[in-house]
Interface confidence: low
């Protein structure tokens, strides 16, 4: 399955929107920084494309879920958030189209299941952190910066997949 060129453009737009969403200075929130343990090894180059697509899909789905909550709506600019949802939704569609085309439809490798679970646990840690910090502006700013970091890493993986085609 060939991810369309518009998919990588959408990824870049998503990062730009995340950057624009910043409301306060991360530097005023240094004490709130947290290591969420992004499972980077699950996004390594050892993956076959069939294994990677569902992991990327899970990553984007979890970002969508995180920013679709009532607490998120209260934290961010509504217009930017709507644009952000649209970009994520389009990327999910692109990845789902790949799955439907047969990529990863065959017996799911255990490694892929483990990777999806690792991504879910990563987002559980983020959600728990937000709850513990009572969804404070600094907590959301720390999470926004973290999602920028992890999303850019997964974007790099998508680009490396394209270049291997």
């Amino acid at each position: 399955c060939d991810l369309p060129q518009t998919h990588s453009l959408g990824s870049r737009r998503t990062l730009m929107l995340l950057a624009q969403m910043r409301r306060i200075s991360l530097f005023s929130c240094l004490k709130d920084r947290h290591d969420f343990g992004f499972p980077q090894e699950e996004f390594g180059n050892q993956f076959q494309k069939a294994e990677t697509i569902p992991v990327l899909h899970e990553m984007i789905q979890q970002i969508f879920n995180l920013f679709s909550t009532k607490d998120s709506s209260a934290a961010w600019d509504e217009t930017l958030l709507d644009k952000f949802y649209t970009e994520l939704y389009q990327q999910l569609n692109d990845l789902e189209a790949c799955v439907i085309q047969g990529v990863g439809v065959t017996e799911t490798p255990l490694m892929k299941e483990d990777s999806i679970l690792a991504v879910r646990k990563y987002f559980q840690r983020i959600t728990l952190y937000l709850k513990e910090k009572k969804y404070s502006p600094c907590a959301w700013e720390v999470v926004r910066a973290e999602i920028m970091r992890s999303f850019s890493l997964s974007t790099n993986l998508q680009e490396s997949l394209r270049s291997k085609e």
Partner: antibody
């Protein structure tokens, strides 16, 4: 493409001030912080502080507190770093750098050599 | 302030060699560690951010590892264009601090 273009070399006397500019282009200026880092001849890199291009907020290293001022002009997408009460040990190349997020810099200016000599 | 200590301060190597540079922080900095390459008369160039993430456009022979206080930059097979000075930088807390640098020159 992203570019940070700095002003030219300066020679100053001890006790004077210097103002270095950094003009940004190729990205949305207000979305990113600009940091300043200096490097004395043959020495390592030293972080000076940051400027929030959006709000104009700043943060300076304790070492430079009271001597450094960072400002910006959003109409020209330019950030300025002014260092006062110059001494010979301020002789260095001064770099501006665009912060991606969480403190790493993907683009740097070409550097401005400031020489402090009597 | 967090002190960053790089070792070695200089090393001589040949093209094709595997090169390892270490960086130690005076306190835990999680994964807020970045690596830069600098050539004479030029601005630093970002290689690795967040301890192990390869910056876009940087050759895959560069890799970073570590978390907490101990970090490593590895060049798997040194190329002629890799002879330069390498700096680690912590971005865990301000003031952000750099290691003193490791100069890699030709043996």
């Amino acid at each position: 493409q992203v570019q940070l273009v700095q002003s030219g070399a300066e020679v100053k006397k001890p006790g004077a001030s210097v103002k270095v500019s950094c003009k940004a282009s190729g990205y949305t200026f207000s979305n990113y912080y600009i940091h300043w880092v200096r490097q004395a001849p043959g020495q390592g890199l030293e972080w000076m502080g940051w400027m929030d291009s959006n709000s104009g907020g700043t943060g300076y290293a304790q070492k430079f507190q009271g001597r450094v001022t960072m400002t910006r002009d959003t109409s020209t997408s330019t950030v300025y770093m002014e260092l006062s009460s110059l001494r010979s040990e301020d002789t260095a190349v001064y770099y501006c750098a665009k912060e991606v997020f969480s403190g790493w810099y993907d683009y740097w200016g070409q550097g401005t050599l400031v020489t402090v000599s009597s | 302030d967090i002190q960053m200590t790089q070792s070695p301060s200089s090393l001589s190597a040949s093209v094709g060699d595997r090169v390892t540079i270490t960086c130690r922080a005076s306190q835990s900095i999680s994964s807020y560690l970045n690596w830069y390459q600098q050539k004479p008369g030029k601005a630093p160039k970002l290689l690795i951010y967040a301890a192990s993430s390869l910056e876009s456009g940087v050759p895959s022979r560069f890799s970073g590892s570590g978390s907490g206080t101990d970090f490593t930059l590895t060049i798997s097979s040194l190329q002629p264009e890799d002879f330069a000075t390498y700096y680690c930088q912590q971005s865990y807390s301000t003031p952000y601090t750099f290691g003193q640098g490791t100069k890699v020159d030709i043996k």
